[in-house]
């Protein structure tokens, strides 16, 4: 998803938390300095999704992707991207 | 940078109603299977998560959408 | 928070008509389908009509088809049910209730209810 | 139409009872099975869908389970407040269709 490009540490976070693997989310949260209590607080959205199920983690997934590759989002990107090329233009 | 509607999915998901946040699902997949999963998540994350909790998810998110990887 | 108000009840005879509304508040209602369900005296609980959220598909329980009309007006947040050729078996309170899932969740669960209003059809 | 049988129809419990429900389907409804609870004179109101999942503000000693034909509803720890009326109700059809209730009342 070439959303996820834009942000990959929210992609990384998002698809360990959804995935219910524990590890993965630690070594996630690390790359941003979360704290204690707010890996404590992000483990309990994992546990919903571990709770709700393979089906329900994958539904979920879908929404995500959904929305990152939604008009919304591809137009920003473009948008973004065309202001990066503006910006390059200027620098040489 | 995070695409805005993806962080508007994310907030409303830790702060806003079950409502609010199915809504907001339902604008991009309105499939019933998928939304009845939003709402039970979304119902989920409200039961488990204090106040403070959800304080510490949206500062983890600023953290995430001010780091250097995003 | 979601507020739903029946109106419309009251005693009718055998053969007659009645219209009961439904003021809906609290929530974005043109993006919810509802339904009415009823609940006869000491009995259980039965669906009896839904309509979509945009109005283009309406759905009845087979003893009421041909008989009883669902409608909605998404710009007065009503619904409504018109209750022709009504019968002693018709005897019930009525319930309006709001899908709990929106748009294409006109899945018939009910998330919602308002507190009923009573229809008696007696000679 | 999909006829749901629920059984017991009336049970007699103690306040801290583990407390089961079942309700089953003429028919598969896959997991498309929502609960409610309904007190004398008040409307009912959703407790669990999808067979297992919580609605908004339900605790957590409510819980759902089933798939296809056969369901329950158990509440874990009865509380003084949950002495009322439990009715499942499928809506794999449009035609949704209800049981015909369990009443729960003190022992």
């Known amino acids: 998803v070439k959303m996820a490009e834009t942000c990959p540490i929210f992609y990384d976070v998002f698809f360990a938390v959804a995935n219910g693997n524990e590890l993965l989310l630690d070594l996630s949260l690390t790359k941003v300095n979360a704290t204690e209590p707010e890996r404590t607080a992000m483990k309990k959205i994992q546990d919903c999704y571990v709770e709700n199920g393979l089906i329900s983690r994958v539904l979920d997934g879908l929404v995500m992707t959904t929305i990152s590759s939604s008009k919304d989002c591809m137009g920003e990107a473009v948008q973004n991207t065309v202001e990066d090329l503006k910006l390059n233009t200027l620098g040489r | 940078e995070i695409c805005p509607a993806v962080k508007r999915d994310v907030d409303l998901f830790l702060t806003g109603t079950p409502d609010e946040y199915v809504e907001q699902v339902a604008q991009y997949k309105a499939l019933p299977v998928v939304l009845e999963n939003a709402r039970i998540l979304k119902n989920c994350v409200d039961a488990k998560m204090t106040e403070e909790d959800k304080e510490n998810a949206l500062s983890v998110l600023d953290k995430i959408y001010t780091s250097p990887l995003c | 928070q979601v507020v739903l108000v029946e109106s419309g009840g009251g005693v009718v005879q055998p053969g007659r008509s009645l219209r009961l509304s439904c003021a809906a508040s609290g929530f974005t209602f043109s993006s919810y389908g509802m339904h009415w369900v009823r609940q006869a005296p000491g009995k259980g609980l039965e669906w009896v009509a839904v309509?979509?959220?945009?109005?283009?598909?309406?759905y009845y329980v087979d003893s009421v088809k041909g008989r009883f009309t669902i409608s909605r007006d998404n710009s007065n947040n009503t619904i409504y049910l018109q209750m022709n050729s009504l019968r002693a078996e018709d005897t019930a309170v009525y319930y309006c209730?709001?899908?709990?899932?929106?748009?294409?969740?006109?899945?018939?669960?009910?998330?919602?209810w308002g507190q009923g209003t009573l229809v008696t059809v007696s000679s | 139409d999909i006829q749901m049988t629920q059984s017991p129809s009336t049970l007699s419990a103690s306040v801290g009872d583990r407390v089961t429900i079942t309700c089953r389907a003429s028919q598969s409804v896959s997991s498309w099975l929502a609960w409610y609870q309904q007190k004398p004179g008040k409307a009912p109101k959703l407790l669990i869908f999808?067979?297992?999942g919580l609605e908004s503000g339900v605790p957590f000693r409510f819980s759902g389970s089933g798939s296809g034909t056969e369901f329950t509803l158990t509440i874990s720890s009865l509380q003084p407040d949950d002495f009322a009326t439990y009715y499942c109700?499928?809506?794999?059809?449009?035609?949704?269709?209800f049981g015909q209730g369990t009443k729960v009342e003190i022992k």
């Open positions: 109700q499928q809506y794999n059809t449009y035609s949704p269709t």
């Open positions: 209730a709001r899908s709990l899932i929106p748009v294409a969740g006109t899945d018939p669960i009910f998330g919602y």
């Open positions: 999808k067979a297992s």
């Open positions: 309509i979509w959220y945009d109005g283009s598909n309406k």
